[in-house]
């Protein structure tokens, strides 16, 4: 069985341009970097920088490359077999439950709390109560109540779109 391709952004149907390489499907599937032709007899290569496929497949079109949003940096470009990898800029993060945009990290913790985790591309700073050690999940405090800290340095991708 082939692995499922889960990327949702799909490129429109492609006609095979002369420069697109063709090969025959194997067991009804085309290799990563290709899609199947409309008659099911050929594998047509994806277009570098435009679209891609990551698994053996019988899709009739390749998947459209993700374009990094403003506020994101491109960690690696789109190839015919891998989608673009985008990451939130330094000082911003993307949460799993709100993946559509990068949000600014808080600059510090509320009074009575201490920072135990830096801002990363995938998480805000982490604060805990000094006494109890319990995590804080409230809103950003007023400026005068914060203990400032410098944002963390991005270390790894926050969103693998491929």
């Amino acid at each position: 069985e082939s692995a499922l391709i889960t990327q949702q952004d799909l490129a429109p149907q492609q006609r095979a341009a002369p420069q697109q390489k063709r090969s025959s499907p194997s067991e009804g599937l085309c290799p990563p970097g290709h899609h199947i032709s409309e008659d099911g007899r050929d594998c047509i290569s994806c277009k570098y920088g435009q679209d891609y496929s990551t698994h053996w497949n019988d899709l009739l079109f390749c998947l459209r490359c993700t374009r990094c949003d403003s506020g994101e940096v491109e960690l690696s470009p789109c190839t015919t077999t891998r989608n673009t990898v985008c990451q939130c800029e330094e000082g911003t993060f993307r949460e799993e439950d709100s993946p559509e945009m990068c949000r600014k990290c808080r600059t510090g913790c509320p009074r009575g709390m201490v920072k135990v985790g830096d801002c990363t591309p995938w998480s805000d700073i982490e604060c805990v109560h000094k006494e109890s050690g319990t995590k804080h999940s409230g809103e950003v405090p007023a400026v005068e109540e914060t203990v400032t800290s410098s944002p963390g340095t991005p270390a790894s991708p926050c969103s693998l779109s491929g």
């Epitope: 149907q13 009804g28 019988d58 009739l60």
Partner: antibody, heavy 113, light 110 residues
């Protein structure tokens, strides 16, 4: 044309093979699909077999059905039928971009003790 | 597996009326969608493929549209012969994603 055969009354757990016979086109050039329809229900995709004899199944059908083919027929083996498998089973010709364009009349399978 | 959500489950319109059936795919399938008509005791009949291309012999009263994840089948100038159940089915990536049909829409012509 496409025509299914082999449907009958079977007891639960008794393997049953349905056969799809084609004429007027070459099975070696087309994929073939199996679909079923329980009484009063909608169409349910089971799986298909490619022109080069590779079979793929709906996730719910894996292990419950086996699709194979010869030069003129496509078989659907029901490995261990249950009462929920009572349905009319359709075989059809599948083309990648144009869908399922040629259907058989269906064959009725009744699974009952 | 891909999931096809079809609405409404049933619709009733008079002769000469118009019916609109919608089909939504759980992921984009470009324009690779087919529509089928099925009458009781008969196998399905392909009406439309590639979202909008009419199959041979199908009257132009039937119109398919859409791309990506959202598709529509419109039947105008309804005739009594149009009373049937209609199904959508994706055509791209049948081995990759499966080819589940939509749940069907029963069209009753009054």
């Amino acid at each position: 044309s496409v025509e299914e055969s082999g449907g009958r009354l079977v007891t639960p757990g008794t393997p049953l093979t349905l056969t799809c016979t084609v004429s007027g086109f070459s099975i070696s050039r087309y994929a073939m699909i199996w679909v079923r329809q329980a009484p009063g229900e909608g169409l349910e995709y089971i799986g298909f077999i490619t022109s080069d004899s590779s079979a793929y199944y709906a996730s719910w059908a894996k292990g419950r059905f086996t699709i194979s083919k010869t030069s003129t027929t496509v078989d659907l083996k029901m490995t261990s039928p249950t009462t929920e498998d009572t349905a009319t089973y359709f075989c059809a010709r599948y083309t990648y971009s144009d869908g399922t364009d040629l259907w058989g009349p269906g064959t009725l399978v009744t699974v009952s003790s | 597996d891909i999931v096809m959500t079809q609405t409404p489950a049933s619709v009733s319109e008079p002769v000469g009326g118009t019916v609109t059936i919608k089909c939504q795919a759980s992921q984009s399938i470009s324009t690779y969608l087919s529509w089928y008509q099925q009458k009781p005791g008969q196998p399905p009949k392909r009406l439309i493929y590639k979202a909008s291309t009419l199959a041979s012999g199908v009257p132009s009263r039937f119109k398919g549209s859409g791309s990506g994840t959202d598709f529509t089948l419109t039947i105008r100038d309804l005739e009594s012969a149009d009373a049937a159940t209609y199904y959508c089915q994706p055509n791209s990536g049948i081995a990759t994603y499966g080819a589940a049909f939509g749940g069907g829409t029963e069209v009753v012509v009054k």
